[in-house]
């Protein structure tokens, strides 16, 4: 037989089909010019010593073969003995190691078989009524196709599906969408209405995420508040990566899961913007405020479930940083200014009450005064911190108040509101004899002592009613008792106690009279 002709004889090897899974597959045959034809196939398995034979049977009952050697592509003309106008069946037999391996048959009319391309270029993927919709432009001059898809998950083999006939400039396919696993899709096409025409190659992989993005399993930690009033939020555990099918590993556009961080600053509710969304990779610095942090996972089909954490406020207080002066016109706070043109947010809430009851005020951008201080004033009529109780005050600062992640904590401290000097006056002052020349003075704790850092000291004043001499004794804010010694028997004394803050002298308690009785010896 001539090499250019199909040989109408028994093949030069015994028929010993191995039935193995490897071997020739994906045989495609088509016309490539007016009188020339091509068949190509793939071979799976070791290629050493393999000889391929393209087999052809005609409807007349005769069969022939082309010897292709080690090649997996073969061209022939319409003069090679193969009927091109009538239906023929073709397959490949690969002879190796004393056995034959067969490809599946293709049955077609060669003359009408055009080489079809798989979907080329961009395949658009969208979700439609719980299914996956793929859409692509029909390859040039190939309108009218039958389309198939195959799909697999990381744990399942390929499954074949049908897209149905296509007859337009754009083609589309509805495919199953998995809820929780990524899928790899490939598409192939063949000429519509041409009995037995060959399938195109499979398209490049189309990688599709699950309908539900994986729930982020992450943990955060927050560092200590730094000197600049900011603390870093750090990710303790990265989100688990989505398992991908084989063809989507490495570069898999389409299956990306985007994790975003949504910050909600709970403190200082009077600021302009309370939430900000960031990429998870860019961990922000936060002020000492309380925050809710949500991690939102999303893919090309939209957001999934999110996970939310609460980051409590940093309650570290600096009792001396804030000066408060109470005048007839109202109250003014002073604190060390941060920088030029800063906006401050002053937040206060009664101690022991729910954080939801916080009140705040936003200052206009201000520069430091000549002493380097920033200020905030309010009148008595405003009612701010007007009740005689302990308030927790936090001051935040930002040069860009519209940017949530640029706030910093200036200070946190406690303040006793209303008329603190009067409200803080100690009550229930009592005097007990202690010795021949001393007494013990006790009092109930000042209301100011409920406010950490506010009560600087108690002062006990003792007045000799005879000589009008006065002595004052400072007492630690944690103490409610003092011993007065060096007293004289028979002399009348009055004792008073006051509670002082760092910026305010207290009001004396009601004078308490006492005297040490003269001891008469027997």
């Amino acid at each position: 037989c001539r090499t250019s002709e199909c040989c109408f004889q028994d093949p030069p090897y015994p028929d010993a089909d191995s039935g193995s899974a490897s071997g020739p597959r994906d045989l495609r045959c088509y016309r490539i010019s007016s009188d020339r034809y091509e068949c190509s196939w793939q071979y799976e398995g070791p290629t050493a010593g393999v000889s391929h034979f393209l087999r052809c049977c005609l409807s007349s009952g005769r069969c022939c073969y082309f010897a292709a050697g080690s090649a997996t592509r073969l061209q022939f003309s319409d003069q090679a003995g193969v009927s091109v106008l009538y239906t023929v069946t073709l397959w490949v037999e690969s002879w190796a190691r004393n056995q034959t391996e067969k490809s599946p048959e293709v049955t077609l009319q060669l003359y009408n078989s055009v080489k079809y391309e798989p979907p080329l270029g961009d395949i658009k993927v969208s979700k439609l009524a719980g299914q996956l919709r793929m859409e692509w432009e029909t390859p040039d001059n190939q309108v009218g196709a039958e389309v198939q898809f195959r799909h697999r998950t990381p744990s399942s083999p390929w499954k074949l599906g049908d897209c149905g006939p296509q007859d337009d400039d754009t083609e589309s396919c509805l495919c199953p969408l998995e809820m929780n696993v990524a899928q790899e899709f490939q598409l192939r096409r063949r000429q519509l209405g041409s009995q037995g025409s060959s399938w195109s190659k499979w398209s490049s992989p189309v990688c599709v995420p699950p309908e539900n993005p994986p729930q982020p399993q992450v943990r955060f930690s927050v560092e200590q508040l730094g000197q600049d009033g900011r603390r870093r939020l750090t990710l303790k555990e990265q989100p688990t990566q989505l398992e991908l099918p084989e063809g989507c590993q490495g570069l898999a556009p389409g299956t990306e899961v985007t994790y975003r961080l949504q910050l909600h600053m709970l403190s200082c509710p009077c600021k302009a913007k309370a939430t900000r969304t960031l990429h998870l990779g860019k961990m922000p610095y936060l002020s000492g405020a309380a925050y809710n942090v949500a991690v939102i996972s999303s893919n090309q089909f939209g957001p999934g479930l999110n996970q939310t954490w609460h980051i409590p406020a940093d309650t570290h207080t600096e009792p001396v940083a804030l000066n408060i002066s109470v005048g007839t016109n109202g109250t003014t706070m002073y604190w060390p200014a941060r920088a030029q043109s800063m906006t401050y947010c002053i937040e206060w809430q009664p101690v022991g009450q729910d954080g939801g009851l916080a009140t705040c005020s936003l200052t206009a951008p201000q520069d430091p005064d000549p002493a380097g201080m920033a200020t905030y004033s309010w009148s008595r009529e405003s009612g701010a911190m007007g009740q005689e109780k302990c308030y927790y005050i936090t001051i935040f600062a930002s040069a860009h108040p519209e940017k949530l992640t640029l706030w910093s904590t200036v200070l946190s401290t406690y303040h006793f509101g209303g008329n603190a000097s009067a409200a803080g006056t100690p009550h229930h002052v009592s005097v007990k004899n202690h010795s021949l020349d001393s007494v013990s003075v006790d009092w109930a704790p000042s209301l100011l002592s409920t406010c950490p850092g506010v009560l600087k000291e108690y002062v006990v004043r003792c007045r000799d009613e005879d000589s009008k001499q006065v002595s004052e004794h400072p007492v630690q804010p944690t103490e409610t008792q003092v011993t007065l010694s060096g007293l004289r028997a028979g002399v009348a004394y009055t004792v008073q106690v006051r509670a002082d803050t760092a910026w305010l002298r207290g009001v004396w308690s009601q004078p308490q009279r006492f005297s040490i009785e003269v001891q008469v010896s027997d």
Partner: nanobody, 126 residues
């Protein structure tokens, strides 16, 4: 040992249908083109229908075209003959036969076939 076992024959009224099956064992079924022959009393065995190893091509004798359909299931090592609109002249013993698919995939004469079954009787009453 190669065995081809036919089944599905029987008595049927004219115009009725039957489906014959031929189960193969002891051979690599997908290497063989298969055919159905029939032999009426006092006549020679005649070719009815043939099919290539993968089922891509089929061939029928003119007298059964449009009425009979040959098919195969390589997973089940079985070839079938669906016979519709049966006529009394279809009465015969039906045999299935197999041949390696070398330079031909069917022969109209029995001598081109390597293996044969024992046959199944089909009787069509007028």
């Amino acid at each position: 040992e190669v065995q081809l076992v036919e089944s599905g024959g029987g008595l049927v009224q004219a115009g009725g249908s039957l489906r014959l099956s031929c189960a193969a064992s002891g051979l690599t079924f997908r290497n063989y083109a298969m055919a159905w022959f029939r032999q009426a009393p006092g006549k020679e065995r005649e070719f009815v229908a043939g099919i290539t190893w993968g089922g891509g091509l089929t061939h029928y004798v003119d007298s059964v075209k449009g009425r009979f359909t040959i098919s195969r299931d390589n997973g089940k090592n079985t070839v079938y003959l669906q016979m519709n609109s049966l006529k009394s002249e279809d009465t015969a013993v039906y045999y299935c036969a197999g041949k390696t698919q070398g330079s031909t995939w069917y022969h109209l004469t029995p001598d081109g076939y390597d293996y044969w079954g024992q046959g199944t009787q089909v009787t069509v009453e007028p």
